[in-house]
Interface confidence: medium
């Protein structure tokens, strides 16, 4: 004999796969004080339930392990706890109260669960800015995991150096310590929930701080091809008159401040231009001599700088004795 | 290309019933639940119940149990809803919408809407 | 039941401006909120769900973030076209409810 009762509170309730879910059920208050019995949980049309308390009473594989009761007669409590959801446990639910001593049981309204797709993604902090040679902790953290499921399995992955840092059931800390062919590169955190069989990750692309590591100078003479000095040059000859077009490039990130200066500058020289650009329409007499690029960053400085040898054409020269 | 269609306008007498329809296509029928959403003129929406069409399961809100009941024909790939004992109150209109049961998202279907009115 | 409250009936914005369209849960809802777009004479527009899974095709000026019970849908860089009623929903337990509605007018 059987005694229907209705459970309190929502008939369906929505997880997302691998997460955790409370079935919530109080038993009724009609249930005498002296009722002694145990519980179980059935998924809608089995006989064998999902989760007792019955020590004699087996349980179902698939579920054994992840579908806990958590009875507490006292208080009425006869809530399931869903942990590791899959795909399969989508379904109804139903609970049933059944004694050994008593003539009749009771048994629950039934309850959907619906298991949705994981959309949840890792998120990945950062504390600062990534400077290279300078060790950073990152975290990728999961906060919309339950404490009480699998703990998930966390993996990074960059082609930065790295090692790995604590970790929580929530998080996982990596210690990068980035070089500059490091920035702009993808770092990939992975999480998988071994409960569920699900796998999820977070991709960003790392922003890399560094000084300049290389500098160099094209020049641009006249009609003809460009050319590039990548070291300290100790002579470029020119020919008087040439119009002369100096570009500066160098790397670093953020980008460094380019400048020209005529000579050896000291630190605090005042530039000749304040770009990467200089123009020198008409060599002569007065352009003869050094001129320095200087990339300046706030994590370093580098220079290039080239010799001008001024070639002074025969009938100028005549002209001038 | 999905689409729910539903049926047109309805104009109904006070303690009447009536039948609105919601026939989908462009995606497999019985892989998504059937919701039903009320909308009272310049007013929020309400969530009527829904429908597994693979087993014809329901699940209503308690202020509709008595006033919709929730069927499919999955034959024809449609999906009912009947209202009854009509009041003035039940003028509104009702849209059927998807949702993928195991899937990435919620309601992401919406059918065009049917008008009710009820008037004597 | 789980009421949902929009505390806004009226938002006002201009195009290119940032909005932020917020909801509140009476009870925690585990990030089970999806956000809708109704324009006028339109069936209702799924844009957000799992309070930030942005739909397929959808912007990516509308961003959703919350947990809990306080949830906020965000439009940047406004467009004339998003003019419309914003609601939010929670997916977390039956019945599913959604709050009253928020208006967004263009300036």
């Known amino acids: 004999q059987e005694r229907r009762f209705q459970l309190e509170g929502p008939e369906s309730l929505t997880v997302q796969e691998g997460l955790c879910v409370l079935v919530p059920c109080r038993l009724p208050t009609t249930l005498p004080a002296s009722y002694y019995g145990y519980g179980y949980w059935f998924l809608e049309g089995a006989d064998v339930p999902v989760a007792t308390n019955d020590p004699d009473e087996e349980v179902q594989e698939e579920t054994r392990g992840r579908f806990h009761l958590l009875w507490d007669p006292r208080r009425k409590n006869c809530s399931l706890s869903i942990r590791d959801a899959r795909r399969r446990d989508n379904a109804a639910y139903f609970f049933r109260l059944k004694s050994k001593w008593m003539k009749y049981g009771y048994t629950s309204s039934k309850l959907s669960v619906r298991v949705m797709a994981l959309t949840h993604r890792p998120n990945i902090s950062i504390p600062g800015t990534l400077e290279s040679g300078h060790p950073s902790n990152l975290t990728c953290s999961v906060p919309w995991v339950c404490e009480q499921g699998t703990p998930p399995i966390f993996s990074w992955m960059s082609a930065a150096p790295t090692s790995l840092g604590p970790r929580t059931t929530q998080s996982s800390v990596l210690t990068i310590t980035p070089r500059p062919q490091d920035h702009s590169t993808n770092l990939t955190c992975q999480v998988t929930f071994p409960g569920a069989g699900v796998t999820m990750e977070r991709t960003i692309q790392l922003n890399v701080s560094y000084a300049p590591q290389k500098v160099a100078i094209s020049i641009f003479q006249g009609n003809s091809a460009a050319f590039k000095i990548l070291q300290n040059t100790s002579s470029l000859p020119v020919l008087e008159g040439q119009a002369l077009r100096l570009l500066c490039d160098a790397d670093g990130n953020p980008p460094a401040h380019l400048s020209w200066f005529q000579g050896f500058p000291a630190l605090n020289a005042t530039p000749i231009s304040n770009t990467g650009v200089l123009e020198l329409p008409q060599v002569g007499s007065a352009e003869e001599g050094d001129f320095t690029c200087r990339a300046q960053h706030p994590l370093g400085s580098l220079q290039i700088s080239l010799s001008l040898f001024v070639h002074w054409k025969p009938e100028g020269r005549a002209g001038g004795v | 290309e999905v689409q729910l269609q539903q049926s047109g306008p309805e104009l109904m007498k006070p303690g009447a019933s009536v039948k609105i329809s919601c026939k989908a296509s462009?995606?497999?029928?019985?892989?998504?639940?059937m919701n039903w959403v009320k909308q009272s003129h310049g007013k929020s929406l309400e969530w009527i119940g829904d429908?597994?069409?693979?087993?014809?399961?329901?699940i209503y809100n308690q202020k509709f149990k008595g006033k919709a009941t929730l069927t499919v024909d999955k034959s024809s790939s449609t999906a009912y809803m009947e209202l009854r004992s009509l009041t003035s109150e039940d003028s509104a209109v009702y849209y059927c919408?998807?949702?993928?049961?195991?899937?990435?998202?919620?309601?992401?279907?919406w059918g065009q809407g049917t008008t009710l009115t009820v008037s004597s | 039941d789980i009421v949902m409250t929009q505390s806004h009936k009226f938002m006002s914005t201009s195009v290119g401006d940032r909005v932020s369209i917020t909801c509140k849960a009476s009870?925690?809802?585990?990030?089970?909120v999806a956000w809708y777009q109704q324009k006028p004479g339109q069936s209702p527009k799924l844009l957000i769900y799992w309070a930030s899974t942005r739909h397929t095709g959808v912007p990516d000026r509308f961003t959703g973030t919350g947990s809990g019970t306080d949830y906020t849908l965000t439009i940047s860089n406004v467009q004339a076209e998003d003019l419309a009623l914003y609601y939010c929903q929670q997916h977390y337990s039956t019945p599913y409810t959604f709050g009253g509605g928020t208006k967004l007018e263009i300036k």
């Open positions: 429908i597994n069409p693979k087993i014809g399961d329901t």
């Open positions: 919408a998807r949702w993928d049961y195991y899937g990435s998202s919620l309601f992401d279907y």
């Open positions: 462009g995606y497999t029928f019985t892989d998504y639940y």
């Open positions: 009870q925690d809802v585990t990030t089970a």
